[in-house]
């Protein structure tokens, strides 16, 4: 006989994303004996809620519990049993939530209680069900990328650990309801609001974050279908051959386009509307989203809101990922430049439908937007956050790092785990295996 | 209100072309819809054919994409189907429909439903020798 | 293509009774978040009339006691209570994905 040596025994935590348009569980898991390791938490699963986002549930709030309990079931049979009790689970809602809660606040306590009380019907150690901030969710989707690509620390081959002189990445992320930029800067913030102060194993960072609420993919969708409606009577965005028929009510239920409303409107009444494949239209129609006006900083990025040049390399997710791999996968065009970009959205938008189609067999579903969704990434990347060719060169777009999904989940439930200390790690003695 | 009609020979020989026409009444053709045929076999299965566009454009179910053809005259408010090389498995009920994307909201998230609202009474093919 | 299984092939309810109708599709007709799934009612020598569109949003001019449910694969229409003028064959259908299919039906008979 021999000894063999086990296995560590591993951790696990569990994020329930409840976004916009639908929700997300993400497990996560590490080594029990390596908790303050950096880059030694990866996920473990995942699995899609079916249906909406949880604040499509507002009428029926026990149905957004409801629709957890298939991937709550897949938890189950994921984790290991006797890990269960000790395996923390959170549930963190973001826009649409925070919109829901705008308009409707008894609505959203209704949801996240009708949440809350499935959740603790699970062995999980539940510790809550919230709306996260737009700050939280710009600053968590930063921790993840740049935990995920060890940014923060690392360990070297002389057994020390050392911070990188790569520096961390900052992070873009366009959600349904509301799009986050995030990045460190050396100066500090002229909006105190806009800056976060973090300390990671030792090191400090000045981190700058703002997140737009109502320029999230789907809201920029539906405020443009608003625009093109009051000034064209049709959608320049849309292919033509395209054709809807839309419900008003549908179109002003949100909070994003309450200022785009008519004054006396039918909101039962159907109104026609075609596409028109105008790319130029298209940009002028999504150039109204961004108001350049009055800054009452040394310098903003749109709607008066203030931000520092962007500077170094940035990670992309969500929306934007989804939106340049259409670009580059479906319809196999170059966006390495923002000149690319540009010239990728307009291609797409001097598409037929038809043409649209027969490039894209099969899909069918919001097939229609991806003009729009194109150039408004084009436009909110290079008019709205002021990236240059320079600088969108150090842009990356990706849904992955180490096989994790990009996003704030793993960066959530990092914090409220304290699974990155603020003291930096001392050098460590142990035995090699090897 | 909108209507539609099927119209044409209710016997066809096997290997021959089949040709129907649908007549629309109360809607222009070029204004909007998308014209759809869809035919019912006899044990009541459904089959969505093709259908061209207000614009003129078309879209076949790639099953029938060979032997399918739908075409349209504006000037009568007409739209046709010829199915050609037809065999007894092309017996079937054959209706004419408009159909439109019904943009609906889910969440806070706007999509765009496909449904077939406008139908034809239908008119019966059978193909035999 | 996506195949649309109903259960049952057929079934008889009594009148002011719950009807209820089962689609099973053989992949997800769920895109961003929405259900691309739609149902039709055909009474004999008829043609099929949309009912339900999205999974659940009823078409305007159709009785609440229709009602449908559902996302992913799984998806369900409620007739309740059953009226004699709801005896006919109901087919659930798919937009998610080109080409648009149809289940094979479900005929419901008023006892």
């Known amino acids: 006989t021999r000894d063999v040596r086990e296995p560590p025994a591993l951790k696990y935590g569990i994020v329930l994303d409840a976004g916009s348009s639908h929700t997300s569980m993400f497990i996560y898991k590490w080594p029990a004996d390596k908790e303050n390791d950096t880059g030694i938490v990866g996920q473990h699963s995942s699995c899609d809620v079916p249906g909406g986002g949880i604040s499509s549930y507002a009428d029926n709030p026990s149905g957004a519990s409801q629709s957890l309990v298939g991937c709550l079931e897949q938890a189950l049979q994921d984790v290991p049993k006797e890990r269960h009790a000790g395996t923390p689970l959170y549930l963190g809602a973001t826009a649409g939530m925070r919109l829901l809660n705008l308009t409707n606040p008894e609505a959203s306590t209704s949801v996240l209680m009708a949440v809350t009380h499935t959740l603790t019907q699970y062995p999980f150690d539940f510790r809550g069900a919230r709306i996260l901030s737009g700050q939280e969710e710009g600053v968590f989707g930063w921790v993840t990328a740049n935990y995920l690509l060890e940014n923060f620390i690392k360990y070297g081959w002389v057994g020390r650990w050392f911070r990188p002189r790569k520096g961390t990445l900052g992070a873009m992320d366009l959600g349904g309801a509301s799009t986050q930029i995030t990045f460190e800067t050396t100066s500090p913030a002229e909006d105190r609001a806009s800056e976060v102060q973090l300390h990671l194993y030792g090191q400090h960072y000045r981190v700058y974050t703002h997140s737009f609420l109502c320029y999230g993919r789907d809201q920029v969708l539906q405020r443009l279908l608003a625009s093109a409606l009051q000034t064209h009577g049709f959608h320049p965005c849309w292919p033509r051959g395209f054709s809807t028929q839309v419900l008003l009510g549908d179109v002003y239920q949100s909070p994003c386009t309450m200022a785009q409303r008519p004054q006396n409107f039918n909101s039962s009444a159907r109104v026609s509307l075609s596409g028109s494949s105008d790319p130029h239209l298209c940009r002028d129609l999504v150039s109204g989203l961004f108001s350049f006006s009055s800054c009452p900083f040394s310098r903003c990025s749109f709607n008066g809101v203030f931000q520092p040049p962007v500077a170094g390399n940035f990670v992309a997710f969500s929306a934007f990922f989804y939106t340049v791999d259409f670009l580059r996968t479906s319809m196999g065009l170059p966006v390495a430049t923002l000149q690319q970009l540009e010239a990728a959205a307009v291609n797409v938008c001097n598409q037929t439908w038809a043409q649209l189609q027969a490039r894209v067999p099969g899909q069918r579903a919001r097939l229609a937007d991806y003009c729009a969704g194109a150039m408004f990434v084009q436009q909110l990347l290079s008019r709205g956050y002021g990236f240059d060719e320079r600088a969108f060169g150090g842009v990356i777009f990706q849904k992955k790092a180490a096989d994790t999904a990009v996003g704030w989940a793993l960066g959530y439930m990092l914090n409220l785990t304290n699974l990155i200390p603020a003291d930096p790690p001392g050098l460590r003695k142990g035995t090699d295996f090897s | 209100d909108i209507q539609l009609q099927e119209s044409g020979p209710g016997l066809v020989k096997p290997s021959q072309s089949l040709s129907l026409t649908c007549s629309v009444t109360g809607y222009s053709i070029t204004s909007g819809y998308y014209w759809n045929w869809i035919r019912q076999f006899p044990g009541n299965k459904l089959e969505w054919m093709g259908y061209i566009s207000y614009d003129g454009d078309n879209n076949y179910n790639p099953s029938l994409k060979n032997r399918i053809s739908i075409t349209r005259d504006t000037s009568k408010n007409q739209f046709f189907l010829k199915l050609s090389s037809v065999t007894t498995e092309d017996t079937a009920t054959y209706y004419c429909?408009?159909?439109?994307?019904?943009?609906?909201?889910?969440?806070?998230?706007?999509?765009?439903?496909?449904?077939?609202?406008?139908w034809g009474q239908g008119t019966s093919v059978t193909v035999s020798s | 293509d996506t195949v649309l299984t109903q259960s049952p092939a057929s079934l008889a309810v009594s009148l002011g009774q719950r009807a209820t109708i089962s689609c099973k599709a053989s992949q997800s007709v769920d895109y961003d978040g929405n259900s691309y799934m739609n149902w039709y009612q055909q009474k004999p020598g008829q043609p099929p009339k949309l009912l339900i569109y999205a999974a659940s949003n009823l078409e305007s001019g159709i009785p609440a006691r229709f009602s449908g449910s559902g996302s992913g694969t799984d998806f369900t229409l409620n007739i309740h209570p059953v009226e004699e003028e709801d005896a006919a064959t109901y087919y659930c259908?798919?937009?998610?994905?080109?080409?648009?299919?149809f289940g094979g039906g479900t005929k419901l008979e008023i006892k």
């Open positions: 259908q798919q937009s998610n994905e080109d080409p648009p299919t």
């Open positions: 429909a408009g159909g439109y994307y019904r943009y609906g909201l889910g969440s806070y998230s706007g999509s765009y439903y496909y449904v077939m609202d406008y």
